[in-house]
């Protein structure tokens, strides 16, 4: 089957990108004696970039897009796992379609797993966006979690906090939010496993369990929060730290009395 090995040079990047249905342009047209106003790069269709985790069966094609604009026309380059990505880094190479700000990889294999970052830049600025690729078996597989989620948070005392965990799983996953806690001054139980508190778990609909919201947080709620996802094949977990800061002395409100509510203990592997 055809498998191009060199990046395709479709066209130079164009700010009048046909990838967008939007005809509007923030650029001023160049006249004989005036230069267009410089514009740092910006995303022209950020809503098309919201899906960051792409779990794709082997042999399929992956297309990542970073539709952009700017003046002068920005350049586009791609990194894999933070390093320069060259066509000879993968069997079959890849194609960069500059006119549509996209990279295309055909016939993906497990070694294509990783983070792919587009960098769009001109002399007035640089923007970047990272996609996560996982190459999966179509048959049931362990859960996969989007990298970087949940994210660490630092908030003021009394604030509300939202942690998010993006899950890709077939079969249906069970999602738990856990917090590492101390019992009688100890973080580890007699069985050598950490003490954890179950804050939330999925019922029939797991999508709402992907978000953990904490209201009116206290200093006692600082610590490590874990998103643990399991199905009958296996499990995955990722954690984030919550830091609750007190305002400066003169700004301090009345003492807040929100006792930590301990649902129950759970030994967590």
């Amino acid at each position: 089957r055809p498998s191009p090995t060199l990046p395709e040079q479709d066209a130079l990047p164009s700010s009048e990108d046909d990838d967008d249905d939007d005809d509007s342009s923030s650029e001023e047209k160049e006249t004989d004696n005036t230069k267009p106003n410089p514009v740092a790069p910006y995303w022209t269709s950020p809503e098309k970039m919201e899906k960051k985790l792409h779990a794709v069966p082997a042999a399929k094609t992956v297309k990542f897009k970073c539709p952009s604009s700017g003046t002068p026309n920005p350049t586009l380059r791609w990194l894999k796992n933070g390093k320069e990505f060259k066509p000879d880094h993968r069997i079959g190479g890849y194609k960069v379609r500059y006119a549509t700000w996209s990279i295309i990889m055909d016939s993906v294999v497990p070694s294509d797993k990783g983070n792919y970052t587009c960098i769009v830049e001109n002399e007035y600025g640089s923007i970047n966006h990272t996609y996560q690729l996982d190459v999966v078996e179509r048959s049931p597989h362990r859960p996969i979690l989007q990298a970087g989620l949940p994210a660490n948070k630092t908030v003021a005392l009394g604030s509300n906090v939202e942690f998010m965990c993006k899950v890709y799983s077939d079969p249906q996953p069970h999602i738990q939010w856990l917090k590492h806690i101390e019992v009688n001054g100890s973080k580890i139980g007699p069985d050598n496993l950490p003490y954890v508190q179950i804050l939330k778990h999925s019922g029939i609909n797991s999508s709402d369990a992907e978000v953990l919201t904490l209201f009116n947080v206290t200093e006692a709620q600082s610590g490590e929060y874990v998103c643990k996802v399991s199905n009958y094949i296996g499990e995955a977990n990722q954690s984030a730290w919550l830091t609750v800061t007190r305002p400066a002395l003169e700004e301090r409100p009345a003492v807040m009395t929100s006792p930590l509510y301990l649902e129950h203990h759970h030994h967590h592997h």
Partner: antibody, heavy 116, light 108 residues
Framework: QVQLQESGPGLVKPSGTLSLTCAVS?????????WSWVRQPPGKGLEWIGE???????SYNPSLKSRVTISVDKSKNQFSLKLSSVTAADTAVYYC?????????WGQGTLVTVSS | SYVLTQPPSVSVAPGQTARITCGGN??????VHWYQQKPGQAPVLVVY???DRPSGIPERFSGSNSGNTATLTISRVEAGDEADYYC???????????FGGGTKLTVL
Amino acid sequence: QVQLQESGPGLVKPSGTLSLTCAVSGGSISSNNWWSWVRQPPGKGLEWIGEIYHSGSTSYNPSLKSRVTISVDKSKNQFSLKLSSVTAADTAVYYCARATDWFDAWGQGTLVTVSS
Amino acid sequence: SYVLTQPPSVSVAPGQTARITCGGNNIGSESVHWYQQKPGQAPVLVVYDDSDRPSGIPERFSGSNSGNTATLTISRVEAGDEADYYCQVWDSTSDHRVFGGGTKLTVL
């Protein structure tokens, strides 16, 4: 150059099971490809039925999923289709094909008629 | 599930340019492939990955894909181009392959 050849009965009775096999030559069924079945009722368009990877991983058209089974026999370099509880609406030319994201090799197709 | 919409028929005079469209929700994010099928024959891939041509396919066949529409363009149409043309994607959301309904190209 990979070649695909469908084989199986051209006539199946209603409520029976349609069984077809696709022999792959000139290439290995263990390559990084999906092995697919596509059908085309007389005078109508192409309909994807389903596919299998050499590991046994499968994917099926949701409208046919309850009646379809696709299997692979690596030792014979072939894959098979079974479609149960057939009706006259399943009368079609059945193609086997090799695919990545697209179909780059096809069998010549075999007409299967469902009739008593 | 994902739906691809094609016009049932397109007519063009020899030597002119034929454009066959394939509509789908945000299809520009998918890779679109095109097949030519002549009566009594199996389909033949003419464009893959939106705009690439397999070896042996004339340069007259080209493709584009953006927004909600992919287009197969056949320039300098010949009588031998008369056939049914199908677009196809692998829908990454549902993990299924989908064909458009097909377009009959008639060369006048």
